[in-house]
């Protein structure tokens, strides 16, 4: 398996009750607007063929996509949560900027691309779904990167 480096976040990032609560509230509000319950973006298949030690790098890719292609374009919605959660997630993304893996990451990019394709195919409802799964994104980042 490729070796990951600098793929670590301090546990304290996930131990802030206020922003954790706001992230989960944002996810809950968006999930109420998600009418496509058959599709799951962050689930088992996202990690198919990806070892546990590579998953922080994978989640970094998912986080960056979510910020750039979902949260920034939808930043006017789901207030006041969005204006607090987006900077928090952007800080996590910044802290993972040096997270890389040495060697082939094609299997990871393939899985991330499937998630991206699903969001794009669903259009705006895909973006809403991604916001509705911010709780899963948060927990997966915590599990993968601490």
């Amino acid at each position: 398996a490729p070796i990951s480096s600098h793929c670590r976040l301090d546990k304290s990032n996930f131990q802030q009750p206020y922003i954790t609560n706001r992230t989960f509230m944002l996810a809950k509000e968006a999930s109420l607007a998600d009418n496509n319950t058959d599709v799951r973006l962050i689930g088992e298949k996202l990690f198919h063929g990806v070892s546990m030690s590579e998953r922080c790098y994978l989640m970094k890719q998912v986080l960056n996509f979510t910020l750039e292609e979902v949260l920034f374009p939808q930043s006017d919605r789901f207030q006041p949560y969005m204006q607090e959660v987006v900077p928090f997630l952007a800080r996590l993304s910044n802290r993972l900027s040096t997270c890389h893996i040495e060697g082939d990451d094609l299997h990871i990019q393939r899985n991330v691309q499937k998630l991206k394709d699903t969001v794009k195919k669903l259009g705006e409802s895909g973006e809403i779904k991604a916001i509705g799964e911010l709780d899963l994104l948060f927990m997966s980042l915590r599990n993968a990167c601490i």
């Epitope: 689930g43 088992e44 298949k45 198919h48 070892s51 599990n143």
Partner: antibody, heavy 120, light 107 residues
Framework: EVQLQESGPGLVKPSQTLSLTCTVS????????VHWVRQHSGKGLEWMGR???????SYNSAFTSRLTISRDTSKSQVSLKLSSVTAADTAVYYC??????????????WGQGTTVTVSS | DIVMTQSPSSVSASVGDRVTITCKAS??????LAWYQQKPGKANKLLIY???TLQSGTPSRFSGSGSSTDFTLTISSLQPEDFATYYC?????????FGQGTKLEIK
Amino acid sequence: EVQLQESGPGLVKPSQTLSLTCTVSGFSLTSYSVHWVRQHSGKGLEWMGRMWSDGDTSYNSAFTSRLTISRDTSKSQVSLKLSSVTAADTAVYYCARSLDFYYDTTLAFWGQGTTVTVSS
Amino acid sequence: DIVMTQSPSSVSASVGDRVTITCKASKTISKYLAWYQQKPGKANKLLIYSGSTLQSGTPSRFSGSGSSTDFTLTISSLQPEDFATYYCQQHNEYPLTFGQGTKLEIK
């Protein structure tokens, strides 16, 4: 309450196919993975393969050519078929559920196991 | 495949004793090691995963530590119900592999 129960014939003849069923309750097969693990008498545990929540499968390469894992979601059952068995396949066979979608390689809930003897 | 080597293969101890079991991986698995308890006639029980995370329902006298290739399971004060066989498992990559087990017996 999460429960898994293995069942199948306790005796299989050499060269035949071993068929086992894992019947689950307390969770949905479309939400969690189910793994098969076996244990030779007095020995360690050996991971055989996995049924993913979406119906895909992963196998230990030691068994790939003779192992098939399938499921029937309507019956909440996962099946294992191991072909061309020999005495070396005599073991206790377990099914186990993953912890969650992230810790999918951690086996949080196990069945009690079923003993299979390969003998003529 | 990653080979998991447990030691000792058996250990005798008394109620109240502190017991440590070790597990060594043939290559780095980061922190991704699980510990299971096996008792005759009972379903195997997940105790610890990710090296040190206690599974819900695991008593606090159990603890796990280690990373990379070397891990330990410690039982701080043995209770009568702890006499069993313990297995380590790397859950970093496929195929999932287990140690050969450590049998904890009453002295």
